[in-house]
């Protein structure tokens, strides 16, 4: 013959414990249901009636089968800077994320507490180490044979276009001005001459790796919610 | 409006019976959750919990007085009753009566009664 | 039986101090835990119950806070009103009252 199923409430034989779904109750002594998610217990368990729950109300949940008296309160409403990527419901907690251009400064259990703006490299300095969901960009020297002339939070150092005859030499935060010493066609009087590189310039999604006599890791800005340091821009 | 009102006799000789009444209104022990317990305080001393009962007539006792007290309701009349036997001065005491919640906290509490045992 | 461990047994303290009162189970009574101010002559009145929530009209100086065995209520701003005891419930395990705390103005 079968073993009998026992209801809840009931006894748990000695040095067993209770089924899934069901905890054992300190006072009553007796093996007592769980409430499902999004419910709470209303009334606990006695020796003889099972666990009354409840539903949670407006603005609180519960994610776990559980036997709480009462429902977690969802978190408060995702600030301006955030995007609400889970809702509050009777099962779930809000879950708030940083929006585009923001990383998350302070995490919590779920989403984020506190978002920062990415920093943005200065002109002379390109992104090194990109920003992430939880950190901050990380600038670096644009090194020598390459610039960056923006404020950005993406932009890396792009290599020089190669002149044949250098107008004016590049720097870290502009690229070379190329003179054309043979000139495909007529200028008019006063006309502005396009530079003409003699390569067009490879489109680099990485930052180029450094000369080995530049300094490398030494320029990397530290990273997470720091003051504006050298080569960034609070903007 | 919930209220709890607690009597019996103020004076009862050392191994008598002390039998005390918690008349009360504003919810009924025929209600999922509730319940009705009885606490004392000896003078100038702390509260300590005696015994109470559930809607479904679950009982639960300090397990320290466990063999002198007896609970009970009658669920009609909005009454729980609490005999305690071979009473002694050390059991000299305020008697409060108050309901408990579903999720087993005392919330409401009656006036109190004062218990003296003594010859 | 779980014994509740209320401490100080008495406190003296300035309107406006912010006062507060411990209660250590001698074992784990997840968050079940209610506290009770009772004034001379008076019925114990709930403040909180479930550790840190608060009950209708009790006003928010009055707070709570633990779980397990280590639990605390405060009251941020000490008014003369509050001069009473103050007792900690247990009731994850039975029911058990801590020995009180006699709150005075100094």
């Known amino acids: 013959l079968p073993a009998q199923v026992a209801f809840t409430p009931y006894a748990p034989e000695p040095g067993s414990t209770c089924r899934l779904r069901e905890y054992y109750d300190q006072t009553a002594q007796m093996c007592c249901s769980k409430c499902s998610p999004g419910q709470h217990a209303k009334v606990f368990c006695t020796k003889t009636s099972d666990t009354v729950c409840d539903s949670c109300e407006d603005s609180t949940y519960t994610q776990l089968w559980n036997w709480v008296p009462e429902c977690l309160s969802c978190g408060s409403r995702c600030s301006s800077d955030q995007v609400e990527t889970q809702a509050c419901t009777r099962e779930q907690n809000r879950i708030c994320t940083c929006r585009p251009g923001w990383y998350c400064a302070l995490s919590k259990q779920e989403g984020c507490r506190l978002c920062a703006p990415l920093r943005k490299c200065r002109p002379g300095f390109g992104v090194a180490r990109p920003g992430t969901e939880t950190s901050d960009v990380v600038c670096k020297p644009c090194a020598p044979g390459t610039f960056s002339n923006t404020t950005s939070s993406t932009d890396i150092c792009r290599p020089h276009q190669i002149c044949n005859v250098v107008a004016i030499p590049g720097n870290a935060s502009m690229d070379a001005v190329c003179t054309s010493t043979s000139p495909t066609r007529s200028m008019a009087p006063g006309a502005v001459h396009l530079p003409q590189p003699v390569s067009t310039r490879s489109q680099h999604t990485q930052p180029t790796p450094e000369p080995s006599t530049a300094p490398s890791t030494s320029f990397l800005l530290p990273m997470g919610p720091s003051p504006p340091a050298e080569g960034s821009t609070g903007d | 409006q919930v209220t709890l009102k607690e009597s019996g006799p103020a004076l009862v000789k050392p191994t008598q019976t002390l039998t005390l009444t918690c008349t009360f209104s504003?919810?009924?022990?025929?209600?999922?959750?509730?319940?009705v317990g009885w606490i004392r305080q000896p003078p100038g001393k702390a509260l300590e919990w005696l015994a109470h009962i559930w809607w479904d007539d679950d009982k639960f006792y300090n397990p320290s007085l466990k063999s002198q007290l007896t609970i009970s309701k009658d669920t009609s009349k909005n009454q729980v009753v609490l005999t305690m036997t071979n009473m002694d001065p050390v059991d000299t005491a305020t008697y409060y009566c108050?309901?408990?919640?579903?999720?087993?906290?005392?919330?409401?509490w009656g006036q109190g009664t004062t218990v003296t045992v003594s010859s | 039986d779980v014994q509740m461990t209320q401490s100080p047994s008495s406190l003296s303290a300035s309107v406006g101090d912010r006062v507060t009162i411990t209660c250590k189970a001698s074992?784990?009574?997840?968050?079940?835990i209610a506290w009770y101010q009772q004034k001379p002559g008076k019925a114990p009145k709930l403040l909180i119950h479930y550790t840190s929530t608060l009950q209708p009209g009790i006003p928010s100086r009055f707070s709570g806070s633990g779980s397990g065995t280590d639990f605390t209520f405060t009251i941020s701003s000490l008014q003369p009103e509050d001069i009473a005891t103050y007792y900690c419930?247990?009731?994850?395990?039975?029911?058990?009252f801590g020995g009180g705390t006699k709150v005075e103005i100094k």
């Open positions: 074992q784990d009574i997840n968050k079940f």
């Open positions: 108050a309901r408990i919640t579903g999720t087993r906290y005392f919330d409401y």
């Open positions: 504003g919810f009924s022990l025929s209600t999922s959750g509730m319940g």
């Open positions: 419930l247990q009731y994850g395990n039975l029911w058990t």
